[in-house]
Amino acid sequence: PGPPPGPPRVSPDPRAELDSTVLLTRSLLADTRQLAAQLRDKFPADGDHNLDSLPTLAMSAGALGALQLPGVLTRLRADLLSYLRHVQWLRRAGGSSLKTLEPELGTLQARLDRLLRRLQLLMSRLALPQPPPDPPAPPLAPPSSAWGGIRAAHAILGGLHLTLDWAVRGLLLLKTRL
């Protein structure tokens, strides 16, 4: 065995990485909030909108105390992956009315992808279990009408907002345990 190829540079400590993941999640939460408000201004929501294919909210704020690091990161990754696929679907099949949300929707998609990469890197650095995401659900059918696309957008952005809000709280709590 030979010598290592020069002194390695120190990559971010996983605790510092958790900090930057929290910042990225907060920034994504602000983007989502802003985009949801933009959508409400253009197409006011008539009540709550649901989409059966979206993940159920991971955890109530009250249950956060019992969380374990692997469980949070695994669940968060799976849920965000689902939202990423829904945002991609929305951009592809949402119809002309939703084109008014570009380029913000594209930026949201890119940041969501970046957050997913960051979470996976954190799990790798900590050597936590990385179960595969749930098998992809059948492809989402295009909305039946322009209003169907708008209702789906309300549901996706609303659900993503709640998930990211939960994620920030969960990650901050986990930081104290690392």
Partner: antibody, heavy 114, light 111 residues
């Protein structure tokens, strides 16, 4: 400067045992998952085992399951690999690696031969 | 037999661009797990070259870049130099093995 220093390699007979150690410095050892990766002479890299940052999760390659045990002592910044029932095909340079792995030691040679 | 498949060898002349492929399956690269690339210079320990598909650790020149699509990934080296002559390995987490897997390695020769 990050340093991972393996020790404990050497010549051992088939069926014998060895314990490898890896002393870490220059980074927060207790915040990183740690791996053992080996490389047989003239061959590619083969992952052997991994242990989570706090020691609560351990995974092994099928080829070593039931024979090798990975462990760590965060108070001593040290990683271990206990190797039992050694076979000729376990002959390799054993690297200790941290994180993704981001950092690698220089390796220690284990030779299993009669 | 490695879980990730790489060509055993690749070559190029100085200044050229070379690409090394890494093919996986639905239990590793295709399962949304990130790909990492390592460079092993002769007689030395491996060194992390690319992580999370396309990120470079500090100190790695921007001549090195990575990409991923579906169940495969690739490493591109532009402006090839003689010091790039080394073995290159891809790696990714594999859910069926509950651990990382490596490609068989590609020996890059600079002609």
């Amino acid at each position: 400067e990050v340093q991972l220093l393996e020790s404990g390699g050497g010549l051992v007979q088939p069926g014998g045992s060895l314990r490898l150690s890896c002393a870490a410095s220059g980074f927060t050892f207790s915040s990183y998952g740690m791996h053992w990766v080996r490389q047989a002479p003239g061959k590619g890299l083969e992952w052997v085992a991994v242990i989570s940052y706090d020691g609560s999760y351990k995974y092994y390659a099928d080829s070593v399951k039931g024979r090798f045990t990975i462990s760590r002592d965060n108070s001593k910044n040290t990683l271990y690999l206990q190797m039992n029932s050694l076979r000729a095909e376990d002959t390799a340079v054993y690297y200790c690696a941290a994180g993704v792995p981001d950092y690698w030691g220089q390796g220690t040679l284990v030779t299993v031969s009669s | 037999q490695s879980v990730l498949t790489q060509p055993p060898s690749a070559s190029g002349t100085p200044g050229q661009r070379v690409t090394i492929s890494c093919s996986g399956s639905s239990s590793n690269i295709g399962s949304d797990y990130d790909v990492h690339w390592y460079q092993q210079l002769p007689g030395t320990a491996p060194k992390l070259l690319i992580y999370s598909n396309n990120e470079r650790p500090s100190g790695v020149p921007d001549r090195f870049s990575g990409s991923k699509s579906g169940t495969s990934a690739s490493l591109a080296i532009s402006g090839l130099r003689s010091e790039d002559e080394a073995d290159y390995y891809c790696a990714a987490w594999d859910s069926s093995l509950s651990g990382p897997v490596f490609g068989g390695g590609t020996k890059l020769t600079v002609l």
